[in-house]
Interface confidence: low
C-alpha cells in the first residue's frame, strides 16, 4: 500500500467518515488578539476519470454553515464571496490542487473564535470534511514590544532607539508605532515590524520614562513598554554598568551619579526645588492655552491640530496628574499617511530651557 | 431484516427520460454510502453512480455522466437515479446497493454489501 | 477507461482448490485501495464475500479467501461445493472511474 494511503490510517483523527475522502489538520489552534497563525491541513479526495481535469476548489467554512445559503470565510475560487469580517484576513493558503488546505489567519480577532470545516469541489466530485474541525481559540495579546538604546545616552549626543515586535507577522497589517518621552525626539525609519526614535537626551531626562506603543489596527489592539532613560553625563572616564530593566532588550544605563557642573547632593537638592518650583510657574502659565487633554494611551491623533511640517514646537495640552515635576504631556502629532517624519523641538540644548516637556511620536 | 427494494423500471423509448427509486429499510440509511449498479442482459457488472451518505459526494461512470443524476432524500430512506437521454445500451437490470459508513463504494470496510433485487429497464423503440 | 480483467471462466472438482484472479493497475487494485469480491448466483443479485482484500463479509464460509500482490488479486476456494457455481467479480475503486468490477469469471462446478 502506498504511504498516502497509509498516512491517513497512521494520523490520529486524520479520518473522516469516509475512507477516501480524508483531512488532516490540528484539532485547535492559538493565536494571540492581532496576530496571525498558519494552519497546515492536508486533504485527499478520489478523481474521478472525468473530473481530472477540473480545477481543484477548496473552501474553509464556519461550523453550522449551510454550503448552498452561507459564504466561506476563504476560498480559492476567485468568483466566490467570502464573509466580509473574514476578507482579507483568512486565506486559504494552502493550494487544493495539490492536496494542500493550509489556512492563514492574520490580524486575528475575538470574533474569530470557533471551529472552521474544509470543502472541496471538483467537478461533479464534492465533499465536505466535517472530521476533523479545525477549532480557532483567540487569546489576550500578552507579547510586548521591545526597546532597544544601543551604548550609552549621553546628554546632547543623539542616539537611534528602536521599538520591535519581532513576534509580529509579515503578512498582517503593519502595526501603528507611537512614542511617548520626555526628551527632545525625532522619528527614524521604520520596517514593519520597528519603528527608530531618535533621541538627543538632556540631564534633566534622566529618570523619565520612554514608551513605545505599538497598536495592530486590523484587530485594534494595542501592546506597549515603557522603559526609564539612564542619560549619563561623563565628561571623563565614564562607567556603565547594565540596567536591570524588564527583561526587554539590552540597555546600557549610567553607573552613578550625574557629574559635572553640580558639586554636592546639597546643591542639587535645592537646584532641584527651584527647578520644580520655576517648572511649576511655566506649567500653570501654560495650563490656560491648552484646550484639550490626551492621554499617553491615546494613538489617535487630535483633529484640528498642526502638522509636524508646519510646527516649530510640539503642541502643549493640559497636564496629567503626576507624583513628580514631570509636567504636562503634550502630544506631536502627525499626518495620517505620514511614515517618516523629521521634528524640530525646542530646548535642544540643556543649558537654555530646564523644563520638562513630554512629546509623543506616532507612525504608521 | 435489510431490505432494499428498487422500483420505477420499465420500457422507455430511446431519448426518453425515467426515474428509478430505492427504498431501504432495515439499517440506518443515512450512515450508508449508496450507488447504483447495473447489469445488461447476459453480461457482466458495471458501476454507474454513488452518492455518500451526506449526499455531497456524486460520482458517476464515464458511460452515464451528464445524462443520470443520483440523489437520495435521508428522511424518506430512498435512493434515486433520475436517467434522461437514454440509450438502447443502458438497458439493464439496475440494482441499488449500499456500504455501511460513509465510503467511496458500497462494500468498504464493514462488509455490509446490501443489494436489492433489481429493476429492469428496457430501452427500444 | 481502467480495464480489471478476469478469466471469463473456470472449472474444478468438488473438493477441489480453486484460485480465480483479478488483474488491475495502479490506478486500482496495484494503487492499494479496498478490494472485494462477490458472488453472484444465477438468478440472484450479487452478494458480498470478500472486503478489504480479504476479510470475509458476515455468513461467508471460510472456504473463500482473499490475497493480493500488487495489481493481482486472487480470490480462494477451497473444498469446492457443487453451490459455489456462480459468477464472481472482483470490485475496487479505481482513479478514472471511481469504482471497477472485473469482467467477472463463471466457475462451472463439474
Known amino acids: 500500500m502506498p504511504l498516502l494511503l497509509l498516512l491517513p490510517l497512521l494520523w490520529a483523527g486524520a479520518l473522516a467518515m469516509d475512507p477516501n475522502f480524508w483531512l488532516q489538520v490540528q484539532e485547535s489552534v492559538t493565536v494571540q488578539e492581532g496576530l496571525c497563525v498558519l494552519v497546515p491541513c492536508t486533504f485527499f479526495h478520489p478523481i474521478p476519470y472525468y473530473d481530472k481535469n477540473s480545477p481543484v476548489h477548496g473552501y474553509w467554512f464556519r461550523e453550522g454553515a449551510i454550503i448552498s445559503r452561507d459564504s466561506p470565510v476563504a476560498t480559492n475560487k476567485l468568483d466566490q464571496e467570502v464573509q466580509e469580517e473574514t476578507q482579507g484576513r483568512f486565506r486559504l493558503l494552502g493550494d487544493p490542487s495539490r492536496n494542500n488546505c493550509s489556512l492563514s489567519i492574520v490580524d486575528a480577532r475575538r470574533r474569530d473564535n470557533g471551529s472552521y470545516f474544509f470543502r472541496m469541489e471538483r467537478g461533479s466530485t464534492k465533499y465536505s470534511y466535517k472530521s476533523p474541525q479545525l477549532s480557532v481559540h483567540v487569546t489576550d495579546l500578552t507579547h510586548r514590544p521591545k526597546i532597544l538604546i544601543p551604548g550609552t545616552l549621553e546628554p546632547g549626543h543623539s542616539k537611534n532607539l528602536t521599538c520591535s515586535v519581532s513576534w509580529a507577522c509579515e503578512q498582517g497589517t503593519p502595526p501603528i508605532f507611537s512614542w511617548l518621552s520626555a526628551a527632545p525626539t525625532s522619528l527614524g525609519p521604520r520596517t514593519t515590524h520597528s519603528s527608530v526614535l531618535i533621541i538627543t537626551p538632556r540631564p534633566q531626562d534622566h529618570g523619565t520614562n520612554l514608551t513605545c506603543q505599538v497598536k495592530f489596527a486590523g484587530a485594534g489592539v494595542t501592546t506597549e513598554r515603557t522603559i526609564q532613560l539612564n542619560v549619563t553625563y561623563v565628561p571623563q572616564n565614564p562607567t556603565t554598568g547594565i540596567f536591570p530593566g524588564d527583561g526587554s532588550g539590552k540597555q546600557e544605563t549610567r553607573a552613578g551619579v550625574v557629574h559635572g557642573a553640580i558639586g554636592g547632593a546639597g546643591v542639587t537638592a535645592l537646584l532641584a526645588l527651584c527647578l520644580c518650583l520655576i517648572f511649576f510657574i511655566v506649567k500653570t502659565h501654560r495650563r490656560k492655552a491648552a484646550r484639550t487633554a490626551v492621554g499617553r494611551n491615546d494613538t489617535h491623533p487630535t483633529t484640528g491640530s498642526a502638522s509636524p511640517k508646519h510646527q516649530k514646537k510640539s503642541k502643549l495640552h493640559g497636564p496629567t496628574e503626576t507624583s513628580s515635576c514631570s509636567g504636562a504631556a503634550p502630544t506631536v502629532e502627525m499626518d495620517e499617511e505620514l511614515h517618516y517624519a523629521s521634528l524640530n523641538f525646542h530646548g535642544m540644548n540643556p543649558s537654555k530651557d530646564t523644563s520638562t516637556e513630554y512629546s509623543e511620536v506616532r507612525t504608521q | 431484516q435489510v431490505q432494499l427494494v428498487e422500483s420505477g423500471g420499465g420500457l422507455v423509448q430511446p431519448g426518453g427520460s425515467l426515474r428509478v427509486s430505492c427504498a431501504a429499510s432495515?439499517?440506518?440509511?443515512?450512515?450508508?454510502?449508496m450507488g447504483w449498479v447495473r447489469q445488461a442482459p447476459g453480461k457482466g457488472l458495471e458501476w454507474i453512480s454513488g452518492?455518500?451518505?451526506?449526499?455531497?459526494?456524486?460520482t458517476y461512470a464515464d458511460s452515464v455522466k451528464d445524462r443520470f443524476t443520483i440523489s437520495r432524500d435521508n428522511a424518506k430512506n430512498t435512493l434515486y437515479l433520475q436517467m434522461n437521454s437514454l440509450k438502447p445500451d443502458d438497458t439493464a437490470l439496475y440494482y441499488c446497493?449500499?456500504?455501511?459508513?460513509?465510503?467511496?463504494?458500497?462494500?468498504?470496510?464493514?462488509?455490509?454489501?446490501?443489494w436489492g433485487e433489481g429493476t429492469l429497464i428496457t430501452v427500444s423503440s | 477507461q481502467a480495464v480489471v480483467t478476469q478469466l471469463s471462466s473456470m472449472s474444478g472438482s468438488p473438493g477441489q482448490t480453486v484460485t480465480i484472479t483479478c488483474t488491475g493497475s495502479?490506478?486500482?487494485?496495484?494503487?492499494?485501495?479496498?478490494l472485494s469480491w462477490y458472488q453472484q448466483l444465477p438468478g440472484t443479485a450479487p452478494k458480498l464475500l470478500i472486503y478489504?482484500?480479504?476479510n470475509r463479509a458476515s455468513g461467508v464460509p471460510n472456504r473463500f479467501s482473499g490475497s493480493k500482490t500488487g495489481s493481482l488479486a486472487s480470490l480462494t476456494i477451497t473444498g469446492l461445493q457443487a453451490e459455489d457455481e456462480a459468477d464472481y467479480y472482483c470490485?475496487?475503486?479505481?482513479?478514472?472511474?471511481?469504482?471497477?468490477f472485473g469482467g467477472g469469471t463463471h466457475l462451472t462446478v463439474l
Open positions: 495502479s490506478s486500482n487494485i496495484g494503487g492499494g485501495y479496498y
Open positions: 478489504n482484500v480479504n
Open positions: 452518492i455518500n451518505s451526506g449526499g455531497e459526494v456524486t
Open positions: 432495515g439499517f440506518t440509511f443515512k450512515n450508508y454510502y
Open positions: 446497493a449500499g456500504g455501511e459508513g460513509s465510503s467511496w463504494y458500497p462494500d468498504y470496510y464493514y462488509g455490509n454489501g446490501y
Open positions: 470490485g475496487s475503486y479505481d482513479e478514472s472511474l471511481s469504482y471497477v
